[in-house]
């Protein structure tokens, strides 16, 4: 994906394996009123020290308080996957929009590919 | 909702050449518009963008050979700063499908011009 | 940049048959993809975009599939107004930057 990877840390000149978020559904049409859900995953291998929660984006824009957002970790002995769902019940022609999920690694910062939403009246 | 190109004619190889679209019930405020070419008896050739918010891209091998701009709320040029008998087409405009203020977007094509014919010859 | 490559070039079928192109992307690109249809003349037309969805006021003739680097466009029961060329493309996009490209074209021939 087209996303900006860590290729070292701040720490140490060792190399990182690149991370980015896996290949989403990328274009979503529906209709006024329906309910959709949809997600950003993540998997961060234990090599990395320091990671910050997952936001969500629309058009530009981080979306804040009264947005039903829920993140799921799942840790392994390579290190934690991360999964961030976003849903949105009854979806207005004003939830139109491109989402992208951003995340820092390492003090640099991973954006998604988009998630575009089209509610069709 | 419409949009006409203008513009094309017949010019020598290096004359610069501006194109306008004119587009009618389109905010351009609010959709991105493109321009895409056709040589004769070729396919679609995708050359650049502008978007609601004045960012411009361009195809790649595009880059330094056009320059698109909002000349107006109602204006788009295409300008082909040093054509070639390589640049002789159909140009035309044509509104992305995505209604936004933002730079970038999924820019589908939903309504396009007739087209203009551009020739460049000796 | 995406390379959208699309095969055949060229299709021949009988009016009431069925044909199908193929496009492929260079690299995933999700469902950002559109079909187009163009006869001579005139400028294309949207027939389906995000890979599967009709846009208005096209028939359920045709019919769009595939996802990440693998697209197909089917029409059935061909009639002899779809005689026309086809055209695949890529409107994937990033935070940062847009990559949008069509695909060489399939000339439909109906006979």
């Known amino acids: 994906a087209h996303t900006a990877a860590p290729q070292v840390t701040s720490t140490a000149s060792k190399l990182l394996p690149p991370v980015a978020f896996n290949h989403t559904i990328g274009h979503i049409v529906l209709s006024e009123h329906k309910n959709v859900k949809f997600n950003c995953s993540i998997n961060i291998p234990n090599t990395y020290q320091e990671t910050a929660g997952i936001s969500w984006w629309k058009d530009g824009k981080e979306l804040l308080g009264a947005h039903h957002s829920i993140t799921q970790f799942y840790p392994d002995e390579e290190g934690v996957s991360i999964i961030a769902l976003f849903s949105i019940a009854s979806v207005q022609r004003s939830d139109n929009g491109s989402y992208f999920c951003k995340m820092k690694v390492n003090n640099r910062e991973i954006v998604s590919d988009p998630i575009y939403v089209e509610v069709q009246g | 909702q419409s949009l006409e190109e203008s513009g094309g004619r017949l010019v020598t190889p290096g004359t610069p050449l501006t194109l306008t679209c004119t587009v009618s019930?389109?905010?351009?405020?609010?959709?991105?518009l493109g321009w895409v070419r056709q040589a004769p008896g070729k396919g679609l050739e995708y050359i650049g963008i502008?978007?609601?918010?004045?960012?411009t891209y361009y195809a790649t091998w595009a880059k330094g050979r056009f320059t698109i701009s909002k000349t107006s709320s109602t204006t788009v040029d295409l300008k082909i700063t040093g054509p070639t008998t390589e640049d002789t087409a159909t140009y035309f405009c044509?509104?992305?499908?995505?209604?936004?203020?933002?730079?970038?977007?999924?820019?589908?094509?939903?309504?396009w011009g007739p087209g203009t014919l551009v020739t460049i010859s000796l | 940049d995406i390379v959208m490559t699309q095969t055949p070039a060229s299709v021949e079928a009988a009016v009431g048959g069925t044909v199908t192109i193929k496009c492929q992307a260079s690299?995933?690109?999700?469902?950002?993809l559109a079909w187009y249809q163009q006869k001579p003349g005139q400028p294309p037309k949207v027939l389906i975009y995000?890979?599967?969805h009709l846009a208005s006021g096209v028939p359920s003739r045709f019919k769009g599939s595939g996802s990440g680097t693998q697209f197909t466009l089917t029409i059935s029961d061909l009639e002899c107004a779809d005689a026309a060329t086809y055209y695949c493309?890529?409107?994937?996009?990033?935070?940062?930057?847009?990559?949008?490209?069509f695909g060489g074209g399939t000339e439909v021939v109906v006979r």
């Open positions: 995000a890979a599967s």
């Open positions: 019930g389109i905010d351009l405020s609010s959709y991105a």
């Open positions: 044509a509104r992305g499908a995505y209604a936004g203020y933002v730079a970038f977007g999924p820019y589908y094509f939903h309504i």
């Open positions: 493309q890529s409107y994937f996009y990033s935070s940062t930057s847009i990559y949008n490209a």
């Open positions: 690299q995933s690109i999700s469902n950002f």
């Open positions: 502008i978007s609601s918010t004045g960012t």
